[in-house]
Interface confidence: low
């Protein structure tokens, strides 16, 4: 009686179980009563990552340099190419099909987390006692200068964008 289901790594065709092609190979011809499944290796720049009965291998992903992408890991006959973003850029989406420049934190905000190839800069407002006077993708909020430790007094209060201004103490006689 012809089978209705096949074992793992097999497929049912013409009422018989044929072996699937291993990862890295594509199907050329199905098995018959007298012959095994015929498979061929994927050519350069192609891959198949599962046991399969595909007649065509998939093209490796192209990490387009004009989209800010570079190769993180070259593809093999069994794996796709993995792209990442160039320095200063991060992926626009999870699939990383293109890249955008890292966001800078505006004055009054500091970098909470520096961007990576897959995530953007995370900014945070400078809390009281801290400031940032630059637009930067790297700089954290900096603490206000401590006038007292320099034996000076605060002449102008600091803000989230400016440091305090220190000056000499008025020595009244």
């Amino acid at each position: 009686e012809p089978p209705t289901a096949c074992r793992e790594k097999q497929y049912l065709i013409n009422s018989q179980c044929c072996s699937l092609c291993q990862p890295g190979q594509k199907l050329v011809s199905d098995c018959t009563e007298f012959t095994e499944t015929e498979c061929l290796p994927c050519s350069e720049s192609e891959f198949l990552d599962t046991w399969n009965r595909e007649t065509r291998c998939h093209q490796h992903k192209y990490c387009d340099p004009n989209l800010g992408l570079r190769v993180q890991q070259k593809g093999t006959s069994e794996t796709d190419t993995i792209c990442t973003c160039e320095e200063g850029l991060h992926c626009m989406s999870e699939s990383c099909e293109s890249c955008v420049p890292h966001r800078s934190c505006l004055p009054g905000f500091g970098v909470k987390q520096i961007a990576t190839g897959v995530s953007d800069t995370i900014c945070e407002p400078c809390p009281v006692g801290f400031f940032s006077n630059v637009s930067s993708a790297f700089e954290k909020c900096r603490p206000w200068t401590s006038c007292e430790t320099k034996d000076l007094v605060v002449q102008q209060a600091g803000t989230n964008k400016t440091d305090v201004v220190c000056g000499p103490q008025d020595r009244q006689r």
Partner: antibody
Amino acid sequence: EVQLVESGGGLVQPGGSLRLSCAASGFTFSSYAMSWVRQAPGRGLEWVSTINNSGGGTYYADSVKGRFTISRDNSKNTLYLHMNSLRAEDTAVYYCAKEGGKYYYYAMDVWGQGTTVTVSS
Amino acid sequence: SYELTQPPSVSVSPGQTASITCSGDKLGDKYACWYQQKPGQSPVLVIYQDSRRPSGIPERFSGSNSGNTATLTISGTQAMDEADYYCQAWASSTVVFGGGTKLTVLG
């Protein structure tokens, strides 16, 4: 038609200086990294330097580091190679080449006709 | 520093297949490309990213790269393919060229 035309080559004494230029046309110059490659008489290709599309990233061969400077003027569609402290071994045909992309350098897909630099006393 | 090694010369009869190799430590982990240079002319890119062919390059040119060796294959070699061939790869922010291979088409 994509074209690169080098100029500025010539005869110079050892220790002298020279500035090579490469005028680009037929493509968006500011979108591509550019390179200089040289070829000494009867020898193979030798990479000299590469600059990214914005001019912010530069790369040099050890043999020219500290003596040569690559730069570009995207408003003029021109690539430059400033060569100082020239030596006899710098004698070669210098080619300007367009890279395949902005940031990552897969290959040089367009080459100029070359300009000859001769360093001799 | 990284080095790419090519045979100085390769000979082939017209219509036959020519293979030019380029070897370097773990070259298969990098992308290789190939240039053709005829006497008195500028180099021309014939293969990039291991096996991709720029438009205008005949289908008889193909490339592969795995392990420590990249190979340029010219099937059905013609007299016009006689030239110097150079492999190239990027390694640690520097471009490296092979020493070049002179392809001679016999006859």
